[in-house]
């Protein structure tokens, strides 16, 4: 049976350009190695934002230069994307792959619409 992935429909980024959401997957098998990828879809173009592979029971680690951080707990991944600007507003899709042991399973969420509003510049003080 195919794998289902759930994520919130909408998230509003903080004034500091940080957005967090939970990605939950219904694992059909007993995976020991999982890969989580965040994709951004804009105008039917899909790009990879970040990706991390982790062993079940361990923390997931993104590359040092990644704009993503995250924690895992069972079949749930808490994702945080930072450094967002208004132009980054868009649909962010959670993709989960059960890499090992076979069989491989793919799960793709419906996406989380992240809205980013650039903060107003502070007025000059006299």
């Amino acid at each position: 049976k195919a794998m289902h992935v759930a994520q919130p429909a909408v998230v509003l980024a903080s004034s500091r350009g940080i957005a967090s959401f939970v990605c939950e997957y219904a694992s059909p098998g007993k995976a020991t190695e999982v890969r989580v990828t965040v994709l951004r879809q804009a105008d039917s173009q899909v790009t990879e934002v970040c990706a991390a592979t982790y062993m079940m029971g361990n923390e997931l680690t993104f590359l040092d230069d990644s704009i993503c951080t995250g924690t895992s707990s069972g079949n749930q991944v808490n994702l945080t994307i930072q450094g967002l600007r208004a132009m980054d507003t868009g649909l962010y899709i959670c993709k989960v792959e059960l890499m090992y042991p076979p069989p491989y399973y793919l799960g793709i969420g419906n996406g989380t619409q992240i809205y980013v509003i650039d903060p107003e510049p502070c007025p000059d003080s006299d």
Partner: antibody
Framework: GVVEPGRSLRLSCTAS????????MHWVRQAPGKGLEWVAV????????HYADSAKGRFTISRDNSKNTLYLQMNSLRAEDTAVYYC???????????WGQGTLVTVSS | QSPGTLSLSPGERATLSCRAS??????LAWYQQKPGQAPRPLIY???SRATGIPDRFSGSGSGTDFTLTISRLEPEDFAVYYC?????????FGPGTKVDIK
């Protein structure tokens, strides 16, 4: 190329135009006049590989990300392995979004 | 996949079916293949058109039953069409449906 039954052959597929190490890569084959048959996949850094039953034990998929190249080592070849072999990219959304032009392998004595 | 061959005239509507042995959720793609060429993706995720695919191609269905529809056949659409599930390994293809000129 043409190869005798029982012999070995290594196929290669060199990719360009995308970040090779960010994508899974597949081999798919097609026997003359027949349909498409998935053979094997290798993921990202090459640490995970999955095979069709028909390929297990005889075929080995590998990749060299520094050379943007995908390989298929085929051992103990049989007549039924005669096919066009395609490499294909596993797109970000999972489907096979780009395909190579294919290589004809003929196993015959 | 059914039928094995579909004989139609240009301008007609083509309806191709694909049935999975178990639920593949939304991980279902359609590919077109012409003689001597590699397959090219038409539809992914059941109903999303791949890059550059004209809107006369559409996909629908859910669970185990899926359909590819070509609303008005153009001369270049006569080819073999394959469905494929890509959610679980092994990634299986249907046997194909040949759309030929009546």
């Amino acid at each position: 190329g043409v190869v005798e039954p029982g012999r070995s052959l290594r196929l290669s597929c060199t990719a360009s135009g995308f970040t090779f190490s960010s994508y899974g890569m597949h081999w798919v084959r097609q026997a003359p006049g027949k349909g498409l048959e998935w053979v094997a996949v290798i993921w990202y850094d090459g640490s995970n590989k999955h095979y069709a039953d028909s390929a297990k034990g005889r075929f080995t998929i590998s990749r060299d990300n520094s050379k943007n190249t995908l390989y298929l080592q085929m051992n103990s070849l049989r007549a039924e392995d005669t096919a066009v072999y395609y490499c294909a990219r596993a797109g970000l959304l999972g489907y096979f979004d780009y395909w190579g032009q294919g290589t004809l392998v003929t196993v015959s004595s | 996949q059914s039928p094995g061959t579909l004989s139609l005239s240009p301008g007609e509507r083509a309806t191709l079916s694909c049935r999975a042995s178990q639920s593949v959720s939304s991980y279902l793609a359609w590919y077109q293949q012409k003689p001597g060429q590699a397959p090219r993706p038409l539809i992914y995720g059941v109903s999303s058109r791949a890059t550059g695919i004209p809107d006369r191609f559409s996909g629908s269905g859910s669970g185990t039953d899926f359909t590819l529809t070509i609303s008005r056949l153009e001369p270049e659409d006569f080819a073999v069409y394959y469905c494929q599930q890509y959610g679980i390994s092994p990634f299986t293809f249907g046997p194909g449906t040949k759309v030929d000129i009546k």
